[in-house]
């Protein structure tokens, strides 16, 4: 019968010929009367056999990630008779893994959007690296993730690649962050290989800013001949939020005389001061009104940012018109 052990050859061996093992018949008494032959894919080109002894050699550098096993056939012939001593047999040469592949992030580029002011622990995104080395061979493909850039705002779970928020962020201070994640094989031990990826994390806006008047005091004038409904001027607040969160409504907070109104131009986000009642210079020629501004949409959980509406004072001077 045939006698052999399981055959392994390490990948990436640089030697010109590497002894893998011996293949022999138990009828071989060592007098060189038998001839061993190797057949199949790789025979002669990748592997050779010593015809007399049955010793098998790898004569080419192998890459396990390209091909991890070779199935070959062996024959043994009696030189004197030319007959097979043993029936032809199939055997396997396995290419054993070395840590020659760094982890790679295949789903690049990574981009995530997370609301500003999200609490610590909020999941942002999961990044996953893959390692072409053999996961069943030691730690060659066992990865650990770490954060190279992004502290103190982000953290990464070492074994899963899940990125979480570790510190609240304010979009109005910075609206996007580049996080760099490293994946290291060999669970970070010496000889480990690594790969990195960048994650662009954008902060979406939440309504955490109330509108504030640009001026604490405005001065407007109105002619006593102005009809009701006349626009006598504009006031403006600014809101550091964006989009819907920056939409605002202006209103009168104080006007004892009930002479003026304020409407909101939702396109320009300006407040337009309107004459509600005709004025009479001889009766009153100086008015003071207080206006306030509030956001249009404020979710209940964000009301804490909107406790006191911004106000401004508007001095309105009536201009005299000579009466006939």
């Amino acid at each position: 019968g045939w006698v052999w052990n399981q055959f392994f050859v390490p990948e990436e061996m640089n030697t010109t010929s590497h002894h893998i093992g011996q293949l022999r018949s138990d009828l071989d008494n060592g007098n060189n009367s038998f001839q061993y032959k190797l057949l199949g894919a790789g025979a002669g080109s990748t592997f050779i056999i010593d015809e007399r002894t049955g010793d098998i050699y790898a004569i080419q550098k192998l890459d396990r990630e390209e091909r991890s096993l070779y199935i070959l056939r062996a024959q043994v012939i009696d030189i004197a008779t030319g007959r097979a001593v043993e029936p032809e047999s199939e055997f396997v040469i396995k290419v054993s893994d070395i840590n020659d592949n760094e982890p790679k992030f295949l789903d690049e580029p990574y981009e995530a959007i997370v609301p500003e002011m999200s609490p610590e622990g909020t999941l942002v995104i999961q990044v996953t690296a893959s390692d072409a080395d053999d996961p069943s061979s030691g730690n060659n493909a066992r990865l650990l993730y770490s954060l190279l850039q992004g502290q103190p705002y982000f953290s990464v779970e070492p074994t899963t690649g899940v990125i979480r928020i570790s510190s609240k962020m304010d979009r109005e201070l910075q609206d996007e962050y580049w996080v760099i994640i490293q994946a290291k094989d060999m669970i970070g031990q010496p000889g480990a290989l690594s790969g990195t990826t960048s994650v662009l994390i954008k902060l979406s806006d939440v309504n955490d800013n109330k509108p504030i008047f640009k001026e604490s005091l405005y001065r407007l004038t109105v002619s006593e001949s102005a009809p009701t409904g006349t626009s006598i001027g504009t006031i403006m607040a600014y809101d550091n939020d964006i989009g819907e969160n920056a939409e605002m409504d202006y209103s009168i907070e104080e006007d004892d005389s009930q002479t003026f109104d304020i409407i909101t131009n939702h396109e320009t986000q300006e407040g337009i001061v309107i004459l509600k009642k005709k004025v009479d210079f001889e009766h009153q020629n100086h008015y003071g009104i207080r206006a306030k501004v509030k956001n249009h949409h404020v979710p209940e959980q964000l009301m804490k940012y909107h406790t006191e509406a911004s106000t401004t004072f508007i001095k309105i001077q009536v201009e005299d018109v000579d009466e006939p």
Epitope: E215, L217, Y218, R219, S257, H286, G288, F313, K315
Partner: antibody
């Protein structure tokens, strides 16, 4: 803190023009929404508002003095001025410059006042 | 023009007493357009109250203002020695006019 300081001659002859200047410090005369006034007080009497000016040059005067009063502004010097023409002894008074308030037309800041006597 | 009449002309009180000063307008004015000032000899008037019950910066809370329509009041709840002075009301709705003043002196 806004401070105002009146300056000008303490003695003016009848029929001449009284000229006073108010220098503003601790704030800009061009601040939006503020009006700069002149007010006077006859000896031992009450207060009389003369007129005001806005930094743009828009002025408004007490109707009883309107024909004789001119108030002007010089934003580069942070000053505003009063001219009162054709003075008589009845114009003898302490003249104050003042700035109105941030929540109304009341007078929040005042100069210390300067006495102008009209006499030949 | 709106004429403001203050009464009494002189109020003689002792320190610690309550002072009530009146200001009456010749026609109705909004309470938002009335102010009170204090003036001591040789000094400029000092804003006390505006609108008509808001205290100006640095004014102690013993000073308070009230009123509406044509009748307005300045109250000094407990007179301090430094409160003896002349007090003026002023309206700033129709041009600007002052009352003739009330003198608060030591009895």
């Amino acid at each position: 803190q806004v401070q105002l300081q009146e300056s000008g001659p303490g003695l003016v002859k009848p029929s001449q023009t009284l000229s006073l200047t108010c220098t503003v410090s601790g704030g800009s005369i061009s601040s939006s929404g503020y009006y700069w006034s002149w007010i006077r007080q006859h000896p031992g009497k009450g207060l009389e508002w003369i007129g005001y000016i806005y930094y743009t040059g828009s002025a408004y005067y007490n109707p009883s003095l309107k024909s004789r009063v001119t108030i002007s502004v010089d934003t580069s010097k942070n000053q505003f001025s009063l001219k009162l023409s054709s003075v008589t002894a009845a114009d003898t008074a302490v003249y104050y410059c003042a700035r109105d308030g941030s929540s109304g037309w009341y007078f929040q800041y005042w100069g210390q006042g300067t006495l102008v006597t009209v006499s030949s | 023009e709106i004429v403001l009449t203050q009464s009494p002309g002189t109020l003689s009180l002792s320190p610690g007493e309550r002072a009530t000063l009146s200001c009456r307008a010749s026609r109705q004015i909004s309470s938002s357009y009335l102010a009170w000032y204090q003036q001591k000899p040789g000094q400029a008037p000092r804003l006390l109250i505006y609108g008509p019950s808001s205290r100006a910066t640095g004014i102690p809370d013993r000073f308070s203002g009230s009123g509406s329509g044509t009748d307005f009041t300045l109250t000094i709840s407990r007179l301090e020695p430094e409160d003896f002075a002349v007090y003026y009301c002023q309206q700033y709705g129709s041009s600007f006019t002052f009352g003739q003043g009330t003198k608060v002196d030591i009895k």
